[in-house]
C-alpha cells in the first residue's frame, strides 16, 4: 500500500482493484468502495454525470452507455477511480457529435470506446475521402481522439472514428468539425462618419462597423472621459466562414449641447485592440460664417476680369444664395458649390465672375446666404481703375486756360510750355487753381479734376500741354499760341 502516516487520511479503495475493467454488455457492474468515511460514487462519461450514495455501485444489466469513469470519494475529499468499459459488439463507440476546435489548439473528437481491446483506433474521412495530409491525431480509448493543432482549413471537415473489431473496420457516427478561428490581427473598425454637427433636439445616430474572423470579438461604444454606459443596438452577419461583421449603432434620440464630445468605438480580441472615433458637436441653433478669399476692397483695371470668392460655413445646409449689385441680382456669372463631397461637409464656396469691367461698374457687390436658422452677407467694394480722360480744355474769357480730366484713381494734371515748334514740352507751369469737382459724389465713379493756368504769362509762340495721369495711364491736350505784333492770336486747342 502507499505509505500513509498514522492519522493521515488515505483515499478509498475500490474493488475490483483495477484501474480499468471490461464488463460484457448485459452483465452486472458491481463496484465496492471501502472507506470508513465513504461519501459517494460518481459516474462520468462525455457530458453525463450520475451519483450514488451506496458504497456498492450496482448496475444489474450493463449497457454500452454505462462505460465511463466511476469515482469513489470519501469525507476528506480524497477519491479513487476505476474506468469501466462495457463491451458491446453492437455499439463500439459512445459519441458526442458536437465538435468544435480552436485554431492552433488541440480538440477532442469525443468517441470513447466501449472495448479498449479493438485495434486501429483512428480517424477516417467521410465517404472514403482522405483526411488532410497534415492532420495529426492521438487516440485515447477512454476520451476519444485528439486532433493536434487544428487548422482553419479543417473547418467543416467530416470525419468518423474508426476501429477494427474482429477483423472488420467499424465507423462511428459522423462528426463535422467546426473551427473557431484564432485572432491573428486586431479587429478592423470603421465609423459611418468621422464628425457630426447637430442642432439641439436632433437625433444623433452613428454606426460602427467591426470586422473580424469570428463573433467572439468584443466591441463597445465609449464616450471619452466618461464611464457612462451608452445605449447600443447590434446587427451582425457572417459573410462566409471567417468573415464576421457587426454593426454597433449608438443613438441619442434628442441631442443636447452638453452631449458634444468625442465618442470612441472600441473593439478587442485576444490579439489586440483597435478603436475609431467620431466627434459630435451640438449647437443651440444653426449658423453661417463667411470667409472672403480675397480682400473685400478690390481694385481692378478697366476692361480686366475679377473673381469675387467667398468660402462659408453653413449649418444647416444653405438654402438661398445670391450676389447683388446696385439692387440687382445676378442670375448668371456666379457659381456655388460644396468645398468637399464629404457627407459631413459644411463648407461651401461661392464665386462671382466679373468680366471686362467698365469704369462704370465699380461699386458694392454683396453676397447673401441663408439657411433655415440665419442669414449672412458680405460686401465687396470694387474700384475700377480707369485711364484719365480729358473732358474739356478751354481758354476762358478771363484769359485762363482750363483743363478738366476724369479717371480713377484721381488724376493729377500737370501743365507744360513748349516754345516754338519743339515737340517735347519740358518746362512745367504751375497751375493757378486745382479742384476735385465730384469729391462728394458717388464713391465708386471716376474722379473729376479741374486745373487752370494763367495764359498771360506766355510771351512767345509755342504750345501748352495739359497732361492728366494716374496709375493706369496718361492723356494730354494741347493749346497753340501765335503772336502777331503785340496781339495774341486765337489759341487753338488740340489733343
Amino acid at each position: 500500500q502507499p505509505s500513509v502516516s498514522p492519522g493521515e487520511p488515505s483515499p478509498p479503495s475500490i474493488h475490483p482493484a483495477k484501474s480499468e475493467l471490461i464488463v460484457r454488455v448485459g452483465n452486472e457492474i458491481r463496484l465496492l468502495c471501502i472507506d470508513p468515511g465513504f461519501v459517494k460514487w460518481t459516474f462520468e462519461i462525455l457530458d453525463e454525470t450520475n451519483e450514488n450514495k451506496q458504497n456498492e455501485w450496482i448496475t444489474e444489466k450493463a449497457e454500452a452507455t454505462n462505460t465511463g469513469k466511476y469515482t469513489c470519494t470519501n469525507k476528506h475529499g480524497l477519491s479513487s477511480s476505476i474506468y469501466v468499459f462495457v463491451r458491446d459488439p453492437a455499439k463500439l463507440f459512445l459519441v458526442d457529435r458536437s465538435l468544435y476546435g480552436k485554431e492552433d489548439n488541440d480538440t477532442l473528437v469525443r468517441c470513447p470506446l466501449t472495448d479498449p481491446e479493438v485495434t486501429s483506433y483512428s480517424l477516417k474521412g467521410c465517404q472514403g475521402k482522405p483526411l488532410p495530409k497534415d492532420l495529426r491525431f492521438v487516440p485515447d480509448p477512454k476520451a476519444g481522439i485528439t486532433i493536434k493543432s487544428v487548422k482553419r482549413a479543417y473547418h467543416r471537415l467530416c470525419l468518423h472514428c474508426s476501429a477494427d473489431q474482429e477483423g472488420k473496420s467499424v465507423l462511428s457516427d459522423k462528426f463535422i468539425l467546426k473551427v473557431r478561428p484564432a485572432f491573428k490581427a486586431v479587429p478592423v473598425v470603421s465609423v459611418s462618419k468621422a464628425s457630426y454637427l447637430l442642432r439641439e433636439g436632433e437625433e444623433f445616430t452613428v454606426t460602427c462597423t467591426i470586422k473580424d474572423v469570428s463573433s467572439s470579438v468584443y466591441s463597445t461604444w465609449k464616450r471619452e472621459n466618461s464611464q457612462t454606459k451608452l445605449q447600443e443596438k447590434y446587427n451582425s452577419w457572417h459573410h462566409g466562414d471567417f468573415n464576421y461583421e457587426r454593426q454597433a449603432t449608438l443613438t441619442i434620440s434628442s441631442a443636447r449641447v452638453n452631449d458634444s464630445g468625442v465618442f470612441m468605438c472600441y473593439a478587442n480580441n485576444t490579439f489586440g485592440s483597435a478603436n475609431v472615433t467620431t466627434t459630435l458637436e451640438v449647437v443651440d441653433k444653426g449658423f453661417i460664417n463667411i470667409f472672403p478669399m480675397i480682400n473685400t476692397t478690390v481694385f481692378v483695371n478697366d476692361g480686366e476680369n475679377v473673381d469675387l470668392i467667398v468660402e462659408y460655413e453653413a449649418f444647416p445646409k444653405p438654402e438661398h444664395q445670391q450676389w447683388i449689385y446696385m439692387n440687382r441680382t445676378f442670375t448668371d456669372k456666379w457659381e456655388d458649390y460644396p468645398k468637399s463631397e464629404n457627407e459631413s461637409n459644411i463648407r461651401y464656396v461661392s464665386e462671382l465672375h466679373l468680366t471686362r469691367l467698365k469704369g462704370t461698374e465699380g461699386g458694392t457687390y454683396t453676397f447673401l446666404v441663408s439657411n433655415s436658422d440665419v442669414n449672412a452677407s458680405i460686401a465687396f467694394n470694387v474700384y475700377v481703375n480707369t485711364k484719365p480722360e480729358i473732358l474739356t480744355y478751354d481758354r476762358l474769357v478771363n484769359g485762363m486756360l482750363q483743363c478738366v480730366a476724369a479717371g480713377f484713381p484721381e488724376p493729377t494734371i500737370d501743365w507744360y510750355f513748349c516754345p516754338g515748334t519743339e515737340q517735347r514740352c519740358s518746362a512745367s507751369v504751375l497751375p493757378v487753381d486745382v479742384q476735385t469737382l465730384n469729391a462728394s459724389g458717388p464713391p465708386f465713379g471716376k474722379l473729376v479734376v479741374q486745373s487752370s493756368i494763367d495764359s498771360s504769362a506766355f510771351k512767345h509762340n509755342g504750345t501748352v500741354e495739359c497732361k492728366a495721369y494716374n496709375d493706369v495711364g496718361k492723356t494730354s491736350a494741347y493749346f497753340n499760341f501765335a503772336f502777331k505784333g503785340n496781339n495774341k492770336e486765337q489759341i487753338h486747342p488740340h489733343t
Epitope: 500500500q1 502507499p2 475490483p16 482493484a17 484501474s19 480499468e20 460484457r24 458491481r30 479498449p116
Partner: antibody
Framework: EVQLVESGGGLVQPGRSLRLSCTAS????????MNWVRQAPGKGLEWVGR??????????EYAASVKGRFTISRDDSKNSLYLQMNSLKTEDTAVYYC????????????WGRGTLVTVSS | DIQMTQSPSSLSASVGDRVTITCRAS??????LNWYQQKPGKAPKLLIY???SLQSGVPSRFSGSGSGTDFTLTISSLQPEDFATYYC?????????FGGGTKVEIK
C-alpha cells in the same frame, strides 16, 4: 515468446528469508498488475499477493497468512517482479507461481512454471 | 474474506460425457469469477473469466455461467486431455480466494 520465469526457490530454514524473482518477456510488463500464487504439495491454489502497475500507484495487497512477513515489489525497467519472504514458516513450503493479470480484468491469464520453496529445519 | 466452495471435490467421467462443476461464493461477487485448469506438475491455465467469457485459445466445449453467488463450469463433451483439476477463483475483493478444486478423473 510471452512468458514468465520464476527463480530463487530452494531449501531454507524456518525464520530465515528468501527472495524470489519473476522475469517477464514478450509483453509490456509495465502495463500489467502482477500476482504471486502458491500451491503447497498436494493442496489447492492459494493467492499470496499482488502489486498494481503505475496506473494503480504500485499499491500492494496480501493474503492474511503472509501479511507483514512477505513484500512484493517490481522493477518495470528490468521487467521483474519480486517476492521478499521473511520469517519463513514450514507452512510456507509450496511451489510459488508468478501470474499476470490482463489489463481489464482480475484473472491470471499467464503463469510461470513455478519455483519450489521448501522451509525445513 | 470471501469463501469459495467447489463441488464436487472429485468426479469420474468418460470421454464424451457432459461434466458440470459448481462453485458457490459466501457473498455476491457479481461476475467476478474465473475458472482454471491444472494438470499435475504444471502451472494452472485460465479457461473462463468474468463468469462466462471464454479465454482465447480455449476450446468451445468449455463454458461458464452464473452471477452473484452461484456459478457453473460445463464441459459439454469431455475429451481425454480434459482430465485435470479445476479451480474457481473470485476476483472481486482481495484476498482473491480459490475454491478447493474439483479433480476430474477417468471412469
Amino acid at each position: 515468446e510471452v512468458q514468465l520465469v520464476e527463480s530463487g526457490g530452494g531449501l531454507v530454514q524456518p525464520g530465515r528469508s528468501l527472495r524470489l524473482s519473476c522475469t517477464a518477456s514478450g509483453f509490456t510488463f509495465s502495463d500489467h498488475d502482477m500476482n504471486w500464487v502458491r500451491q503447497a504439495p498436494g493442496k489447492g491454489l492459494e493467492w499470496v499477493g499482488r502489486t498494481r502497475n503505475a496506473a494503480g500507484s504500485y499499491t500492494t495487497e496480501y493474503a492474511a497468512s503472509v501479511k507483514g512477513r512477505f513484500t512484493i515489489s517490481r522493477d518495470d525497467s528490468k521487467n521483474s517482479l519480486y517476492l521478499q519472504m521473511n520469517s519463513l514458516k514450514t507452512e510456507d513450503t509450496a511451489v510459488y507461481y508468478c501470474a499476470r493479470e490482463p489489463k481489464y480484468w482480475i484473472d491470471f491469464d499467464l503463469w510461470g512454471r513455478g519455483t519450489l520453496v521448501t522451509v525445513s529445519s | 474474506d470471501i469463501q469459495m466452495t467447489q463441488s464436487p471435490s472429485s468426479l469420474s467421467a468418460s470421454v464424451g460425457d457432459r461434466v458440470t462443476i459448481t462453485c458457490r461464493a459466501s457473498q455476491s461477487i457479481s461476475s467476478y469469477l474465473n475458472w482454471y485448469q491444472q494438470k499435475p506438475g504444471k502451472a494452472p491455465k485460465l479457461l473462463i473469466y468474468a463468469a462466462s467469457s471464454l479465454q482465447s485459445g480455449v476450446p468451445s466445449r468449455f463454458s461458464g455461467s452464473g452471477s452473484g453467488t452461484d456459478f457453473t463450469l460445463t464441459i459439454s463433451s469431455l475429451q481425454p486431455e480434459d482430465f485435470a483439476t479445476y479451480y474457481c477463483q473470485q476476483s472481486y475483493i482481495a484476498p482473491y480466494t480459490f475454491g478447493g478444486g474439483t479433480k476430474v478423473e477417468i471412469k
